[in-house]
């Protein structure tokens, strides 16, 4: 009896694992083995596919074959008993195009209200992704074990810290990788769970902000208790992208070591141009807080995000505010080539009740003012980029008196 060729051959590639699956074409024939050949582009001869010769099952692994993953290959299969079937040719494919990203490795560390997630590619030193290691981004799904309500976090790198969690609570999460440059989305990791610790005696510092004054950066934060000392550390933001490296060499800012106030001042030349992460820790001599949330600090934006300059035209019931480019030392205007949003705060000079206007335009009307009343105005600029989320300091307040009634034209 003539052997029939096997059918429906599937090629599954996950990371560096190459798996072939196929269907027997004749279940009634026993003791059949299967063998594959492969052919590279531009070659006429077929080569035996190692790992896939005389296979008794309907699955084989040819991961040991050192292929150029960017080069198209063709496979063929036949069944063998006493005689052999005809060859069945599989559609040619490029391994890299066909490959899926496998589940990443996930390593968790817990604090009282935060979890640190370290993510590594599932296959160490992968050949498939050798040129794409730094291009991996990850997304995760996290939920409280008790509730199951899921939160998705997109576009994270090999180290990510999740804050504002509840103490003594078990959180579960799963992570998948993506190579956006190649439109590839990976497979989720297994679910990993970790319990946050009991609440720490000392909370971490909060609301860290960086501003520029003269040639210095001013770093400010809030803290619950008095008589504390603080230290500040920085890290190059790109180091969070480094796959497989989970040693983070946070550096001390010398002028911000063991400071006793909730701010520190350090020269701008401490940092070269770039994007950094900053974090602050508090200590009372006996106990230490966990580190604060890490804030992103872009020297380019920070250096040039100066408070806006504005002019006020006073009417009886409103102010017209014209916002101009801030001035550098030397009175030259700063060119800001990224979109800004302006926050304008105004108040009656005799009162503390502040009102706020947020506006994208550079000419703003402040309505509903009383005639012949002194109002004060201050403004600051914010970048519209959510990730960087930078703000200038407020301008100095400018106070003006509204005109008498009926001068609104």
């Amino acid at each position: 009896k003539n052997l029939k060729s096997p059918q429906k051959v599937e090629v599954d590639i996950i990371d560096d694992n190459f798996i072939l699956r196929w269907n027997r074409s004749d279940e009634s024939v026993g003791n059949v083995t299967f063998s594959f050949d492969y052919q590279k582009t531009g070659m006429d001869n077929w080569i035996k596919l190692s790992g896939c010769q005389n296979i008794t099952s309907t699955k084989c692994n040819f991961s040991s074959l050192k292929l150029n993953v960017y080069e198209e290959i063709k496979l063929r299969i036949r069944a063998e008993k006493e005689n052999t079937s005809s060859w069945y040719e599989v559609d040619s494919f490029t391994p890299f195009r066909k490959a899926q990203i496998g589940p990443p490795e996930v390593h968790l560390e817990a604090e009282d209200k935060a979890i640190v997630i370290h993510i590594s590619p599932g296959t160490k030193d992968s050949v498939m992704w050798a040129l794409d290691g730094l291009s991996f981004t990850y997304s995760l799904v996290i939920w409280k074990n008790s509730s199951g309500v899921e939160e998705r976090i997109e576009n994270i790198y090999s180290r990510h810290k999740i804050y504002k969690l509840s103490p003594e609570t078990t959180y579960c999460l799963k992570v998948k990788a993506a190579l956006l440059t190649s439109w590839k989305i990976g497979v989720y990791s297994p679910v990993h769970c970790i319990k946050t610790t009991v609440e720490n005696e000392l909370p971490p510092p909060e609301n860290i902000e960086v501003s520029v004054q003269n040639q210095n950066y001013v770093l400010k934060w809030d803290y619950t208790y008095a008589n504390m000392t603080f230290q500040v550390q920085w890290l190059h933001a790109f180091l969070k992208r480094n796959p497989g490296n989970h040693l983070y060499k946070w550096k001390q800012i010398p002028d911000c070591e063991n400071v006793k106030t909730t701010q520190c001042v350090f020269p701008q030349n401490v940092f070269q141009k770039g994007i950094y992460l900053l974090r602050v820790q508090a200590s009372d001599g006996n106990n230490t807080s966990f580190w604060s949330e890490e804030i992103k600090f872009d020297t380019e934006i920070q250096a040039f995000l100066l408070p806006p300059v504005f002019n006020i035209r006073s009417l009886s019931d409103s102010f017209h505010i014209y916002i101009g480019a801030p001035k550098q030392s030397g009175n030259t205007p700063v060119i800001q080539d990224y979109p800004l949003i302006y926050e304008i705060i105004f108040w009656e000079n005799t009162s503390n009740a502040e009102r706020k206007i947020i506006e994208k335009k550079t000419d703003v009307t402040v309505p509903n003012l009383k005639p012949l009343t002194v109002y004060c105005v201050k403004a600051r600029a914010h970048t519209m980029d959510e990730k960087l989320n930078k703000s200038s300091v407020f301008s100095d307040a400018v106070c003006e008196k509204t005109k008498p009634g009926n001068t609104s034209k």
Partner: antibody, heavy 118, light 107 residues
């Protein structure tokens, strides 16, 4: 293969100084931290301090501030521990260790025995 | 400095038994704890990191647990080669500090 090879045993007089070395192979020390740990006979482990060989930044345990100085020579992939004003309390085995992923001291040298005696 | 206390200096066990070594931190250190094993005449070797992750090549009879201030190293099915001293260490805050060690004796 990752290895940390430490210099040989030292017998030194009280008040003197000593410099121990630790030569790394199988990795570039600039990519890691290097720590030094003290162990007295039949006693526990004490962390002395660490260095980032990339820029020479050091951290010390308060107890060893002024007593210990950690340096590196990146061209020879070597770390050094200098101990000054030695007393009998400094008699111990000193280990050099690599600070790797997750800040784990993942590889340890064989230890250098320092004996302070007149 | 954070004090790591291993209250039991010695523990006696038999081959095949299950034994737990404990360690207490003087303040919350999250899960930033490492366990080391030091066999007689040898250098220490990392066993468990981040409180519960087994270091590569470490047999699965070694498990770590705990968080905050209380940590445990458990050896299930103790083998004669587990005769050693076990140290915990916190890596939450400088200076890093070690526990005083627990010597495991095998009867």
């Amino acid at each position: 293969e990752v290895q940390l090879l430490q210099s040989g045993a030292e017998l030194v007089k009280p008040g003197a100084s000593v410099r121990l070395s630790c030569t790394a192979s199988g990795f570039n020390i600039k990519d890691y931290y290097l720590h030094w740990v003290k162990q007295r006979t039949e006693q526990g482990l004490e962390w002395i301090g660490r260095i980032d060989p990339e820029d020479g930044e050091t951290k010390y345990a308060p107890k060893f501030q002024g007593k210990a100085t950690i340096t590196t020579d990146t061209s020879s992939n070597t770390a050094y521990l200098q101990l000054s004003s030695l007393t009998s309390e400094d008699t111990a085995v000193y280990y050099c260790t690599r600070g790797g992923n997750y800040d784990v001291m993942d590889y340890w040298g064989q230890g250098t025995s320092v004996t302070v005696s007149s | 400095d954070i004090v790591m206390t291993q209250s039991q200096k010695f523990m006696s066990t038999s081959v095949g038994d299950r034994v737990s070594v404990t360690c207490k931190a003087s303040q919350n250190v999250g899960t930033y704890v490492v366990w080391y094993q030091q066999k007689p005449g040898q250098s220490p070797k990392a066993l468990i990191y981040s409180a519960s992750y087994r270091y590569s090549g470490v047999p699965d009879r070694f498990t770590g647990s705990g968080s905050g201030t209380d940590f445990t190293l458990t050896i299930g099915n103790v083998q004669s080669e587990d005769l050693a001293e076990y140290f915990c260490q916190q890596k939450n805050t400088y200076p890093f500090t070690f526990g005083g060690g627990t010597k495991l004796e095998i009867e």
